[in-house]
């Protein structure tokens, strides 16, 4: 079967939106009026993995683009990267752990843990303009609450 | 074309048991992750349990853990939802659905599903 995806936008607690910066790099930031079509479309995909009420397993992928967000340890440090891959193969249902974020949902927001990394998440600065990246805390001066936004197709 | 016939339904005192069946044709039954959705009188769809293809894999809602067992036979083509101590609030149309899959605790996509089958719990 093939796996299934949707599209959606994906904006921090502070209402911050997430945009390209370079060619591998997302940053947050505030965006209004027509500035949001800046804003980065994900493809979603559901992907097999660790299930329960609050968790469901997925991958993100950026809309028509052959990246995924993936994590991977670099310098002995848990990060965040937007990682290229072959689109003939790409989404599926079995993706690499690194690829897998557990999507958490708490009170009508979004966490979203890395699945390789258990308790580190995909966070965003309080301030303005700077990169996302992949934290290991929550509830600090750092943001890993997010809401999603359904995108059609 | 898909095809998914959902039988077992009834009545059934608070306390009792049901089997739920779902006989599917029209698509490869093995490969799909399946699933079962409710909708109570006057209420909206929720989501009840999904089971993955192969079967290794089942997930269920807070509301019916430890009561309700989904499985597959895929040699048969069929789903089933093992309904134990079932209670007034389960009272609901069932449904079967294919290539079920849960976007959030309120949503979900799937691609078919069945005419549903009446589960009444009543004394």
């Known amino acids: 079967a093939p796996v299934r995806s949707l599209n959606c936008t994906l904006r921090d607690s502070q209402q911050k939106s997430l945009v390209m910066s370079g060619p591998y790099e997302l940053k947050a930031l505030h965006l209004q009026g027509q500035d949001m079509e800046q804003q980065v479309v994900f493809s979603m995909s559901f992907v097999q993995g660790e299930e329960s009420n609050d968790k469901i397993p997925v991958a993100l992928g950026l809309k028509e683009k052959n990246l995924y967000l993936s994590c991977v340890l670099k310098d002995d440090k848990p990060t965040l990267q937007l990682e290229s891959v072959d689109p003939k193969n790409y989404p599926k249902k079995k993706m690499e752990k690194r690829f897998v974020f557990n999507k958490i949902e708490i009170n009508n927001k979004l966490e979203f843990e890395s699945a390789q990394f258990p308790n580190w998440y995909i966070s965003t600065s309080q301030a303005e303009n700077m990169p996302v990246f992949l934290g290991g805390t929550k509830g600090g001066q750092d943001i890993t609450d997010f809401t999603m936004q359904f995108v059609s197709s | 074309e898909v095809q998914l016939l959902e039988s077992g339904g009834g009545l059934v005192q608070p306390g009792g048991s049901l089997r739920l069946s779902c006989a599917a044709s029209?698509?490869?039954?093995?490969?799909?992750?399946m699933g079962w959705v409710r909708q109570a009188p006057g209420k909206g769809l929720e989501w009840v349990s999904s089971?993955?293809?192969?079967?290794?894999?089942?997930y269920y809602a807070d509301s019916v853990k430890g009561r309700f067992t989904i499985s597959r036979d895929d040699s048969k083509n069929t789903l089933y939802l093992q309904m134990n101590s079932l209670r007034a609030e389960d009272t609901a149309v069932y449904y079967c659905?294919?290539?079920?899959?849960?976007?959030?605790?309120?949503?979900?996509?799937?691609?078919?599903w069945g005419q549903g089958t009446l589960v009444t719990v009543s004394s």
């Open positions: 089971i993955s293809a192969m079967g290794n894999r089942t």
């Open positions: 029209g698509f490869t039954f093995e490969d799909y992750q």
């Open positions: 659905a294919e290539n079920l899959v849960r976007v959030s605790k309120a949503r979900w996509m799937f691609d078919y």
